[in-house]
């Protein structure tokens, strides 16, 4: 995952649960018991906003040590600060845990900028606002890091929710979610509702804000509207999916669909932006520029360098187009589309110098490692990571930011042929997957 774009957030947990709706009649296939319905204790268990990551409270060790942990579907290690660091408010103290077991093995994780390294062990882990279970999980105790923890953040570790294939040091290190499913009766599925604020939050507002929900082991009906549509997980490493078509305001970008997935497309809660391969990014920006040409935005805006501002309350949402990504469906030759609004891809930014205005950053950026459907996408939707059935579900989020004219959408089915051809086959080499 793109560590450089993930910024932490100062906050504590809490907040009253949302009211739950009664389960609706739907035309969806029935699923095994325990996978749907009401998960009151898990609703609102995340804090955060798109620019700063989303984190959940976890406890580690005996007696339990409480830590805030970044929820990251783009990596697979459970790693926590385990030594004093100027940017950490607290850290995991292994010597205070009677249940800690040392694996006598080190782990080193480099990023493009920075790295973390630590010692592997296992300990008892639970999620206070999660399922009422305790599991023995692998923990990377971070003893040294460079440009990993960020000043002013309120998280002390990272929960990698992807598959063992991209775990460090190798795929023999069982990720947390695998351990959870193996050791308990929790179904092999989790779902995320990330709620972007739609306006910049100062520190005191963040403390009181609701960030979203991570429902472990199920699907909560109160968190979405309409139907869930599923796309296959192409390969169990990252949460890799296949995009078959892209539209800006209904206009097809008309690119070879392989370009959309070059060299992969992943769903990653640990990345802020919608990141697109270079050619796709350039075509998308050209199209968005054309659609919004009633105003002249600086080149730096499209690069994410310059903010654009409007007098408070006057943001002209209507001049910006909607963006639709068509995803491969579960049925042969069938796809569905997810549509986001400018309220998702223009990220509100608080800048003291321009505090009298509403200012935004363009949250679509260029990638050299494929498409990354980060928080910008996920904030529009309730996303179900159905690992048991090797699929990812999307439905319109009950908390997405929209206006009176347009709403995010999940629609289908559409007939799309030769979708398998849209996947890119990465040459088999020893992948340094985290070097992105």
């Amino acid at each position: 995952t793109q560590h450089g774009i993930r910024l932490p957030l100062r906050s504590g947990l809490g907040g009253a649960p949302l009211g739950l709706r009664l389960p609706r009649e739907t035309d969806e296939e029935p699923e095994e018991p325990g996978r749907r319905g009401s998960f009151v204790e898990m609703v609102d268990n995340l804090r955060g906003k798109s620019g700063q990551g989303y984190y959940v409270e976890m406890t580690v060790g005996s007696p339990p040590q409480t830590l805030n942990i970044l929820v990251d579907t783009g990596s697979s290690n459970f790693a926590v600060g385990a030594a004093p660091h100027p940017f950490l408010h607290r850290y995991y103290q292994r010597q205070l845990s009677s249940t800690y077991r040392d694996l006598r093995k080190g782990v080193y994780v480099p990023y493009t900028q920075g790295k973390w390294e630590g010692e592997l062990g296992t300990d008892l882990v639970s999620i206070p606002h999660g399922p009422n279970v305790t599991v023995r999980a692998n923990i990377a105790a971070i003893t040294e890091s460079d440009k990993f923890f960020i000043n002013g953040s309120n998280w002390e570790g990272i929960l990698g929710l992807a598959y063992a294939e991209i775990a460090r040091p190798d795929d023999s290190l069982e990720p947390f979610f695998d351990s959870l499913v193996k050791q308990t009766h929790v179904p092999n599925l989790f779902s995320l509702q990330l709620c972007g604020a739609g306006f910049p939050l100062n520190q005191s507002e963040v403390l009181a804000s609701v960030g979203g929900s991570m429902i472990i082991g199920g699907i909560d009906h109160s968190l979405y509207t309409g139907s869930l549509w599923y796309t296959p997980i192409r390969r169990e490493w990252y949460y890799e999916v296949i995009i078959v078509r892209v539209e800006i305001n209904g206009q097809d970008l008309k690119m070879d669909c392989k370009e959309y997935n070059y060299d992969k497309s992943i769903v990653d809660s640990g990345t802020t932006n919608l990141r697109l391969p270079k050619k796709v990014f350039e075509a998308a920006v050209k199209s968005i520029k054309a659609a919004s040409s009633t105003e002249k935005f600086p080149d730096g805006f499209w690069l994410g360098e310059q903010l654009v501002c409007w007098q408070a309350g006057t943001t002209p949402w209507n001049i910006f187009p909607v963006i639709s990504l068509y995803l491969m469906g579960e049925v042969t030759n069938q796809s569905f589309r997810i549509t986001i609004l400018p309220q998702q891809y223009l990220r509100p930014v608080e800048d003291v110098a321009t505090s009298q205005d509403d200012c935004y950053k363009f949250a679509i950026s260029q990638s050299s490692t494929g498409t990354v459907m980060g928080a910008v996408i996920m904030e529009g939707f309730y996303v179900v990571f159905d690992r048991a059935r090797k699929r990812i579900g999307f439905a319109v989020s009950a908390c997405h930011v929209h206006d009176e004219f347009r709403t995010a959408a999940v629609e289908g089915p559409f007939v799309t042929l030769d979708m398998e051809d849209c996947g890119y086959n990465i040459p088999q080499t020893d992948e340094s997957t985290l070097m992105t």
Partner: antibody
């Protein structure tokens, strides 16, 4: 309070290099690009280039390619500019400036004097 | 590169007067223009962005106007502390460029 604290005055020999620093505080360093601007005595302002601290992406004014190299250290919230093969033409005050809308925040400047 | 021209290098005014500093862009830059004030021995201070928006804390005697290629910074009720050099800047496209500056002298 947002502050950009620049390193002190530099007196350097022709042909050598110098590395200037700009330590940011009061905001999340990786959220905003950092720019560098040159001002020769009694003259106007000249944009050198910029760096995105979150990805280390850089963009230079063509006039300064090969002359200036921009880097960041995100752990300390510091931006750096290295100037190489110095000549008397490089004697100037150099400012770092944070992006937002245009350049809302500026450092106090670092004076570089190139002299033998 | 876009050339920003401030044709008047110096302007003389009196306390309480109104003065207008002009800036011309060599091509259309929309409203992507900023104005800065630089006092002797100090770093530039941001006054105006998006051609006409005042940065927080800037006195309302400073107003900006214009779009396309012609821009104006107006200081009404000039104060002695306004003695400074004023620069315009286009941030519409790279490389960002500045005007040559206009020095305001107080009579």
């Amino acid at each position: 309070e947002i502050q950009l604290q620049q390193s002190g005055t530099e007196l350097v020999r022709p042909g050598t290099s110098v590395k200037l620093s700009c330590k940011a505080s009061g905001y999340t360093f990786t959220n905003y690009w950092m720019h560098w601007v040159k001002q020769r005595p009694g003259q106007g302002l000249e944009w050198i280039g910029m760096i995105d601290p979150s990805a280390a992406y850089t963009n230079y004014n063509q006039n300064f390619k090969g002359k200036a190299t921009l880097t960041v250290d995100t752990s300390s919230g510091t931006a750096y500019m290295q100037l190489s093969s110095l000549t008397s033409e490089d004697s100037a005050v150099y400012y770092c400036a944070r992006s937002g809308v245009a350049f809302p925040y500026w450092g106090q400047g670092t004076t570089v004097t190139v002299s033998s | 590169d876009i050339v920003m021209t401030q044709s008047q290098k110096f302007m003389s005014t009196s306390v309480g007067d109104r003065v207008s500093v002009t800036c011309k862009a060599s091509q259309n830059v929309g409203t992507n223009v900023a104005w800065y004030q630089q006092k002797s021995g100090q770093s530039p201070k941001a006054l105006i962005y998006s051609a006409s928006h005042r940065y927080s804390g800037v006195p309302d005697r400073f107003t900006g106007s214009g779009s396309g290629t012609d821009f104006t910074l107006t200081i009404s009720n000039v104060q002695s502390e306004d003695l400074a050099e004023y620069f315009c800047q286009q941030y519409n496209s790279y490389p960002y460029t500045f005007g040559g500056g206009t020095k305001l002298e107080i009579k």
